[in-house]
């Protein structure tokens, strides 16, 4: 009954803070609208990164200013995090919900810790 | 901090109907998706209602369906709870919840009582 | 739907003792969607645990859950007299979302 949703469990951020992870979902029925929100859970607090609804077959649409950018492909959520820091360094967890048609399921992910390092900065040349 | 407020309970008779509201404040409504709960004199809880972030998307038990309709105005940060119908069986503490990040009702209001009887 | 049972209906300990309920579902639950909530007489529910075993925030750490599949239990390792109310299982990870009758944690 339960929903399972997958991700990987470490992600190394590029130098540029680009992070990309799949959110890969059971689906126990035919949903038509998919709602997929990234969390960030730190010192046991969590709070949302990101979110869109998407209908199935049509791409994921995140607001102008989110830090996310998406792709879907049935079951599976390609998901990219931009602008991260060292310190945004955390677990971002992957939540599922089939919205449309009932009944309604929810799949939480393990989360995927993403590690984040600041580049160096370039030494000046003469 | 997060408060969920309910109002519109009282004393109503049999058939009639009966308008719950739910003011909420301290956190982004819209980006929540909310519940009904009630829970019968001396009874346990019981799901009544649920609304997706946007109220496009409603659930309903199957004891109120056809009868309860639940609304949500994200500008006003206000959900409502349309009840028509009434049943004596209808009588209790009605609940307005906030669902959580992970799922779990995490916020609950006081409650509003409901009573219908002749 | 998930039919969520409690047992037993009501638990007469003494402060300080330890308090074991039990919450059985009809099918399979994930444990990432099943709470316990705790209710005291003219108050609001108030959450305790999600997920099975994490606490919420504010929860002291006498309160645990565990549990998988299709039996989860709550334990109270010393009860305080703040304790004493009822307590109520949860799933949330389908609709309609479900309750189990509750458990009465009363004073001996």
């Known amino acids: 009954k339960a929903m399972h949703v997958a991700q990987p469990a470490v992600v190394l951020a590029s130098s540029r803070g680009i992070a990309s992870f799949v959110c890969e979902y059971a689906s126990p029925g035919k949903a038509t609208e998919v709602r997929v929100t990234v969390l960030r859970q730190a010192d046991s607090q969590v709070t949302e990164v990101c979110a869109a609804t998407y209908m199935m077959g049509n791409e994921l649409t995140f607001l102008d200013d989110s830090i996310c950018t998406g792709t879907s492909s049935g079951n599976q959520v390609n998901l990219t995090i931009q602008g991260l820091r060292a310190m945004d360094t955390g677990l971002y967890i992957c939540k599922v919900e089939l919205m449309y048609p009932p009944p309604y399921y929810l799949g939480i992910g393990n989360g995927t810790q993403i590690y984040v390092i600041d580049p160096e900065p370039c030494p000046d040349s003469d | 901090q997060v408060q969920l407020v309910e109002s519109g309970g009282g004393v109503v008779q049999p058939g009639r109907s009966l308008r719950l509201s739910c003011a909420a404040s301290?956190?982004?409504?819209?980006?929540?998706?909310m519940h009904w709960v009630r829970q019968a004199p001396g009874k346990g809880l019981e799901w009544v209602t649920f609304?997706?972030?946007?109220?496009?998307?409603?659930y309903y038990a199957d004891s109120v369906k056809g009868r309860f309709t639940i609304s949500r105005d994200n500008s006003k940060n206000t959900l409502t709870l349309e009840m028509n119908s009434l049943t004596p069986e209808d009588t209790a503490i009605y609940y307005c919840?906030?669902?959580?990040?992970?799922?779990?009702?995490?916020?609950w209001g006081q409650g509003t009582l409901v009573t219908v009887s002749s | 739907e998930i039919v969520l049972t409690q047992s037993p209906g009501t638990l007469s300990l003494s402060p300080g003792e330890r308090a074991t309920l039990s919450c059985r579902a009809s099918q399979s639950v994930g444990s990432s969607y099943l709470a316990w909530y705790q209710q005291k007489p003219g108050q609001a529910p108030r959450l305790l645990i999600y997920g099975a075993f994490s606490r919420a925030t504010g929860i002291p750490d006498r309160f645990s859950g565990s549990g998988s599949g299709t039996d989860f239990t709550l334990t109270i390792s010393r009860l305080e007299p703040e304790d004493f109310a009822v307590y109520y299982c949860q799933q949330y990870g389908s609709s309609p979302w479900t309750f189990g009758q509750g458990t009465k944690v009363e004073i001996k």
């Open positions: 301290g956190f982004t409504f819209s980006s929540y998706t």
């Open positions: 609304i997706s972030y946007d109220g496009n998307n409603k």
């Open positions: 919840a906030r669902t959580g990040w992970l799922g779990p009702f995490d916020y």
